[in-house]
Amino acid sequence: GCDRNCGLITGAVIGAVLAVFGGILMPVGDMLIQKTIKKEVVLEEGTIAFKNWVKTGTEIYRQFWIFDVQNPQEVMMNSSNIQVKQRGPYTYRVRFLAKENITQDPKDNTVSFLQPNGAIFEPSLSVGTEADNFTVLNLAVAAASHIYPNPFVQVVLNSLINKSKSSMFQVRTLRELLWGYTDPFLSLVPYPVSTRVGMFYPYNNTADGVYKVFNGKDSISKVAIIDTYKGKRNLSYWESYCDMINGTDAASFPPFVEKSQVLQFFSSDICRSIYAVFESDVNLKGIPVYRFVLPSKAFASPVQNPDNHCFCTEKIISKNCTSYGVLDISKCKEGKPVYISLPHFLYASPDVSETIDGLNPNEEEHRTYLDIEPITGFTLQFAKRLQVNLLVKPSNKIQVLKRLKRNYIVPILWLNETGTIGDEKAKMFRSQVTGKINLLGLIEMILLSVGVVMFVAFMISYCACRSKTIK
């Protein structure tokens, strides 16, 4: 009798020990995970994060779609709507260069760096070649007439435009449009001015920064958050809090991301900080990630979202700050009338696109999203989509703009910059992070379940035996 009872009690005790051990392993395991994650996401030599941060292991592609103008003469002569037809994708591999001038500052736990720019054309991922021709707005004519609204100078510009046989529109190759060409009109200016023009000129052999970001050594909740950009905490482009440099560069975020969080990040492409909100759970190559998207609210007018009041910098084009979905970044582009929007004027007010025919905004294709692994805060997949537009205004002094009766925010191109963790990297991530966490969770659950089941089963058996013995 004793042997059996002792056996049952022993079984119950073992069950209890297993259950307690499983229970203890939950907070202890979480602590271990947190400790490991905290150690590995710090931006210093020797960590997983640092290795991937210095040079991204993910292949990043930037696809361009060019808006080819179908009716240039009609627009110039009759101020008709601009008919555009998008052509693309034309794909370039970007962000393949390692960060440069990496300098740790132990005093304030920051690391500074430059992000070099480079683009390599990928013919196999493109619909044509870099020599393909497009009819687009004449960038120099539109910009010069905006930068110099002075009627006297506009007469001078008109002489130069006519002499160079320039017009409101021009035919340019993809390579010229993106990376730069010598403009014939600007070449006539008898002063030392930059005569090269291009949507991304200069790009190759340039670098973005200097960025100075927190390395996370003192506080993991600050890791990758930008401290300063080009030596400043503000941009000097916007009023009030709109001018602040908030969050990270979106390549990663501090670990342990919650669905309720609003993720702030700074994008030098759009000359501002912006934010993303949780949309859905996604399974990316076996890794559970959170999909964060840029909400339409971020592009709203101050009427719809008062927080955006300081992004409205002028009253005329914005129709007294009631227009939405376009951002005037001219202050960030040496006065050139550049407007940033989402592709096809997604989330933009009807007045913005009423002068353009041929646009088809589509949330799935044209919004920006980030897929973030919540434990590490790493962005494992993203699609950054934006459209670059140029404002062109009527001018009674410039012949080629004389017959325009209204302002046009002219779409030049839109881009889709994407990156997805590679299969090898995903496998490694699964084994090193997700796998280990899942394994730990599984062990916890098995120990707890087996322990509880053993304890309950042995206790019931023991009680049953006891009651039989008493009878």
Epitope: N150, V156, N158, S159
Partner: antibody, heavy 117, light 107 residues
Framework: EVQLVESGGGLVQPGGSLRLSCAAS????????IHWVRQAPGKGLEWVAW????????YYADSVKGRFTISADTSKNTAYLQMNSLRAEDTAVYYC??????????WGQGTLVTVSS | DIQMTQSPSSLSASVGDRVTITCRAS??????VAWYQQKPGKAPKLLIS???SLYSGVPSRFSGSGSGTDFTLTISSLQPEDFATYYC?????????FGQGTKVEIK
């Protein structure tokens, strides 16, 4: 070195004509455009005429419109001011000046035009 | 036409003085204002363009300020060679117009 040299001034009777020349060196006049500015004795400066770059448009002060004509000979790198139907109030030192953005960075030494009977 | 009104029309000052000349445009000319110095029997010389931009070779004691309709030329410490007549000019719109001039004389 940029230089502007005016010539052609002198004494002329009311109703008469005169042609001023402005010879430029050190730059191409067609790239900049040339202005004529005058200064009556003891008075301030008065803008008179302008020829825009690359033989573009010509502009005149209301006081000389229809009487004065500005022109340029790019082969000689010289600008001219043809002055017809001259009046006593046209008496002044006439300067030619270089400008692109509307301010005058180089001036000639001036030539005196006296309209008197 | 845009009128440029300069004040004062003349002033007396001593070497080392700070001198301020003002110019008012009859309509908004943004920052398209130039300042010139003219000595008797000589052609004017450019001092400042775009209201504030000092022309090359001009001493740093000369400075310009203003935007819209009100503009100022300041000589921080008057030197003997600065006694001359000063003109403002708008280069925003044709016809280009000058102020009537300010004569700076020795006190």
């Amino acid at each position: 070195e940029v230089q502007l040299v005016e010539s052609g001034g002198g004494l002329v009777q009311p109703g008469g004509s005169l042609r001023l020349s402005c010879a430029a060196s050190g730059f191409t006049i067609s790239s900049f455009g040339i202005h004529w500015v005058r200064q009556a004795p003891g008075k301030g400066l008065e803008w008179v005429a302008w020829i825009a770059p690359y033989g573009g448009e010509t502009y005149y002060a209301d006081s000389v419109k229809g009487r004065f004509t500005i022109s340029a000979d790019t082969s000689k790198n010289t600008a001219y001011l043809q002055m017809n139907s001259l009046r006593a109030e046209d008496t002044a030192v006439y300067y030619c000046a270089r400008s692109f953005f509307g301010y005058f960075d180089y001036w000639g030494q001036g030539t005196l035009v006296t309209v008197s009977s | 036409d845009i009128q440029m009104t300069q004040s004062p029309s003349s002033l007396s000052a001593s070497v080392g003085d700070r001198v301020t000349i003002t110019c008012r445009a009859s309509q908004d000319v943004s920052n398209w204002v130039a300042w010139y110095q003219q000595k008797p029997g000589k052609a004017p010389k450019l001092l400042i363009s775009y209201a504030t931009s000092l022309y090359s070779g001009v001493p740093s004691r000369f400075s310009g300020s203003g935007s819209g309709t009100d503009f100022t030329l300041t000589i921080s410490s008057l030197q003997p060679e600065d006694f001359a007549t000063y003109y403002c000019q708008q280069h925003s719109n044709a016809p280009l117009t000058f102020g009537q001039g300010t004569k700076v004389e020795i006190k």
